[in-house]
Amino acid sequence: NKILVKQSPMLVAYDNAVNLSCKYSYNLFSREFRASLHKGLDSAVEVCVVYGNYSQQLQVYSKTGFNCDGKLGNESVTFYLQNLYVNQTDIYFCKIEVMYPPPYLDNEKSNGTIIHVKGKHLCPSPLFPGPSKP
């Protein structure tokens, strides 16, 4: 039995930041789980990990240097990413593993989300000047 994952097909990261919501066909309440976000068609880069084990507090980390945070819903985990670069535009896949209670469960590979990173340091057009930071 596999958990199904729904993601937005595409998101635009303005200001180098984005929120990506992973929706699962499984209630994570009172479960020990590891939710992760992976970059690339081959999911080669593990961008962010959100670990939950019954307590109220999620443990969030990245072994690949991404600035991330996570929020838990009953059947979702939202990944918040900051400081993205334009060249990190790519497809991102949500993954979920439920370790406890048995049986161990993971997900069918989702369709992924293309995150298009629009840099904030763009040259403003003369007709539409961008906001200036004080």
């Epitope: 507090q57 240097g65 400081n83």
Partner: antibody
Framework: EVQLVESGGGLVQPGGSLRLSCAAS????????MHWVRQAPGKGLVWVSR????????SHADSVKGRFTISRDNAKNTLYLQVNGLRAEDTAVYYC?????????????WGQGTLVTVSS | EIVLTQSPATLSLSPGERATLSCRAS??????LAWYQQKPGQAPRLLIY???NRATGIPARFSGSGSGTDFTLTISSLEPEDFAVYYC?????????FGQGTKVEIK
């Protein structure tokens, strides 16, 4: 005026535990990410742990993962760091620091620190 | 993790002189670099954020510049109270990291 006041440090034996506290005032505590940063005697600054504004998520440096736990009580405007399995290399002044919830890891105000000494 | 290397380790100058402190990152941190001042027995104080923005209440003699991997903190004319240790810190990549510090001492 923003104030952060740490307490709970002291002398502890290797393997021992302490709970550090940071009492906050002068700002809306529940709107900010909070951090612990430490400084070994005569050394530089090292980030230890963070907690988001509502306490629902946390991150820890690899060197303390599994031993240190960060928490907060927004009703009491207090940040905590539970430190277990202390080692000699954890000897340091522990500072709590505030970070805006939009810039996560930019520390705009710091407490005066509390000294943790791990020695037998 | 990103390594920040500060130079020089110690800068010996007289009041009124210009101080130039360098911070180099092992990989690009965009403009997400801050500078802190720490005096003996005191907590660090934020001086500059996002490479070039002065924090609230910081005098105009402090300025920051740079992006990518190379950053500079300049104190245009040293005041007696500016003799301290200065740290750079990046928040572009997790985990956040600090440089080892530059001590500005009285010559």
């Amino acid at each position: 005026e923003v104030q952060l006041v740490e307490s709970g440090g002291g002398l502890v034996q290797p393997g021992g535990s302490l709970r550090l506290s940071c009492a906050a005032s002068g700002f809306t505590f529940s709107s900010y990410w909070m951090h612990w940063v430490r400084q070994a005697p005569g050394k530089g600054l090292v980030w230890v742990s963070r907690i988001n504004s509502d306490g629902s998520s946390a991150s820890h440096a690899d060197s303390v993962k599994g031993r240190f736990t960060i928490s907060r009580d927004n009703a009491k405007n207090t940040l905590y760091l539970q430190v277990n399995g202390l080692r000699a290399e954890d000897t340091a002044v522990y500072y709590c620091a505030r970070a805006d919830s939009s810039s996560w890891y930019e520390f705009d105000f710091w407490g005066q620190g509390t000294l943790v000494t791990v020695s037998s | 993790e990103i390594v920040l290397t500060q130079s020089p380790a110690t800068l010996s100058l007289s009041p009124g002189e210009r101080a130039t402190l360098s911070c180099r990152a092992s990989q690009s941190v965009s403009s997400y670099l801050a500078w802190y001042q720490q005096k003996p027995g005191q907590a660090p104080r934020l001086l500059i954020y996002d490479a070039s923005n002065r924090a609230t209440g910081i005098p105009a003699r402090f300025s920051g510049s740079g992006s990518g991997t190379d950053f500079t903190l300049t104190i245009s004319s040293l005041e007696p109270e500016d003799f301290a240790v200065y740290y750079c810190q990046q928040r572009n990549n997790w985990p956040p990291t600090f440089g080892q510090g530059t001590k500005v001492e009285i010559k």
